[in-house]
């Protein structure tokens, strides 16, 4: 038998226990107040920086893009899709008309000055949303020229020129000196491309990927 | 409401229920002690030495790492 | 990391918590109760076997990995 | 060589048209390039009135919008200006310029101008 | 459109001596910009285009420089056909302007 402990010392014996117990219970809740803590301003410190992000994002874009026009992308509150304010937007593009009138190399050096490229038309549905926009005595620079002049016509942004998604008037191409592409309205055929001196001043359609902040 | 103010909702739950408990369990445990205490006062002495093996457990728990 | 995935790390961290939590302080309250039928049964020995029982206890707390 | 000759009478009166022709040799104004008139007011100020291109398209200076017209006849390699409602303010010389050269960048051929005085 | 400001208005130098004549743009023109001379009672004639590069034939005295706005011409060693009338022109986006020009005579 060991010896009996005297009450004092079992008090006391209990009193370590409790202190011991609840310095476990403390440092439980900080830890667990240390993780909730956590997962409530690391979030918010994240949104910050995501926010940070997104003005530095912007600020590039503000030189040539003072006002953007945002729509939400999904349910997501986090993505945020934008167009340049005066620009309009189609699937994941925005497309911008510019009325001034240079030659087509102005014209591509025009839209790159704003981030974009002369218009790469992949689509019917994409030529359709475009021509909802333009005027029908007026001629609009595409991003589809042939620089050799040897008919091998290729887009600004190096996607593959694909005979089949062309939309051609009739007769068109008709001309070797002719390097560069128009989109223009004629009575018979109503909307198509034609080629034409890359020299002459037309106006032009700008397009440009989303922005997303 | 979106997806990730449903996980915030949720952690602030845990959270909750996570003190709670801890609370719950400090309290019984101590409960269970006094109620030792007293079993020792009443009968001769079976818990002699209980102390001591306590003592380890605790030696053991305080030097488990804090969750990173 | 991404803002949702810490979200969702750290609910695991405390669901994991709250779940360990919650089966030591069952498994107490069964030690309890257990214990007050024994000292019912026989009030010359409240508590026999307790001692065991507690360090299996903390045998299981000891062993349990950190939260990462 | 490119050669561009301007033509037309040298007094307008006031509130008549004024016409100009522009006889290109050299090229033929349909295969290329766009063709312009430009004028210089007696300050020595010059003004880019506005062209038609190889394609027939035509510009015209928004300021002269409602009073210009530029034509061509591609069989006689020539193209026209009319402008109507004149006053004395349009008293210039008219020169037709081709434009197009240098990818743009510069009118290397003009005429060697006429004389247009606007006066009652 | 883009307004086109040239200075100074009149130059006066002699034989030899060196000039420059400046253009202001008042838009961006991506280096599109042109000078002409122009002699008494003769069309203008092309000197530079695309800011620095020399029209054909003309004398390697004649340079151009500039970017964004700001553009000049320089010419060294004046000789005495380079007298006469000097303008710049931008050809970035039509209409393209003049600019008021500059009168350079022998002093």
């Known amino acids: 038998m060991v010896p009996e402990e005297e009450p004092q010392d079992r008090e006391k014996g209990l009193w370590w226990f409790q202190l011991k117990v609840w310095s476990m219970a403390v440092v439980s809740i900080l830890l667990l107040s240390v993780c909730f803590t956590v997962s409530s301003v690391v979030p918010h410190n994240f949104m910050y920086s995501k926010t940070v992000k997104r003005l530095s994002k912007l600020r590039e874009y503000q030189q040539y893009h003072p006002s953007l026009t945002c729509v939400m992308e999904g349910k997501d509150i986090e993505d945020w899709s934008c167009c340049p304010t005066p620009w309009t937007s189609f699937q994941s593009s925005c497309y911008f008309i510019s009325t001034g009138m240079q030659s087509w190399t102005k014209s591509q050096k025009n839209c790159s000055v704003m981030g974009a490229d002369l218009v790469v038309i992949n689509t019917r549905e994409e030529q359709d949303f475009i021509i909802q926009n333009l005027k029908r005595n007026s001629s609009y620079f595409l991003g589809l020229s042939d620089p050799g002049g040897r008919r091998h016509w290729q887009w600004v942004d190096q996607t593959p020129y694909n005979e089949n998604v062309t939309f051609w008037h009739s007769g068109e191409p008709n001309n070797l000196d002719e390097r560069c592409a128009i989109i223009n309205f004629r009575s018979s055929e109503e909307w198509g491309w034609n080629d034409i001196h890359c020299h002459v001043p037309q106006k032009s359609i700008c397009k440009m990927k989303k922005i997303y902040i | 409401l979106g997806e990730p103010q449903l996980c915030y909702i949720l952690d602030a739950i845990l959270f909750l229920y996570g003190i709670v408990l801890t609370l719950l369990y400090c309290r019984l445990k101590i409960q269970v002690r006094k109620a030792a205490i007293t079993s020792y006062e009443k009968s001769d002495g079976v818990y002699t030495g209980l102390s001591t093996r306590n003592q380890e457990t605790y030696e053991t728990l305080k030097h488990e790492k804090p969750p990173q | 990391l991404g803002e949702p995935q810490l979200c969702y790390i750290l609910d695991a961290i405390l669901f994991l918590y709250g779940i360990v939590l919650t089966l030591l302080y069952c498994r107490l309250k069964i030690q309890v109760r257990k214990a007050a039928i024994t000292s019912y049964e026989k009030s010359d020995g409240v508590y026999t076997g307790l001692s065991t029982r507690n360090q299996e206890t903390y045998e299981t707390l000891k062993h349990e990995k950190p939260p990462q | 060589d490119v050669q561009l000759q301007e033509s037309g009478p040298g007094l307008v009166k006031p509130s008549q048209s004024l016409s100009l022709t522009c006889s290109v040799t050299?090229?033929?104004?349909?295969?290329?390039?766009?063709w312009n008139w430009i004028r210089q007011f007696p300050g020595n100020k010059l003004e880019c009135m506005g062209y038609?291109?190889?394609?027939?398209?035509?510009y015209y200076n928004p300021s002269l919008k409602n009073r210009i017209s530029i034509t061509r006849d591609t069989s006689k390699n020539q193209f026209f200006l009319s402008l109507n409602s004149v006053t004395t303010e349009d008293t210039a010389t008219y020169f037709c310029?081709?434009?197009?050269?240098?990818?743009?960048?510069?009118?290397?051929?003009w005429g060697q101008g006429t004389l247009v005085t606007v006066s009652a | 459109d883009i307004q086109m400001t040239q200075s100074p208005a009149s130059l006066s130098a002699s034989v030899g001596e060196t000039v420059t004549i400046t253009c202001r743009a008042s838009g961006n023109i991506h280096n599109y910009l042109a000078w002409y001379q122009q002699k008494q009672g003769k069309s203008p004639q092309l000197l530079v285009y695309?800011?620095?590069t020399l029209a054909d034939g003309v004398p390697s005295r004649f340079s151009g420089s500039g970017s964004e706005t700001q553009y000049s011409l320089k010419i060294n060693s004046l000789q005495p056909e380079d007298f006469g009338n000097y303008f710049c022109q931008h050809f970035w986006i039509i209409p393209y302007t003049f600019g008021g020009g500059t009168k350079l005579e022998i002093k």
């Open positions: 695309n800011a620095k």
């Open positions: 050299g090229y033929s104004i349909s295969s290329g390039y766009y």
């Open positions: 038609i291109s190889y394609d027939g398209s035509n």
């Open positions: 310029v081709r434009g197009g050269d240098y990818d743009d960048g510069g009118f290397a051929y």
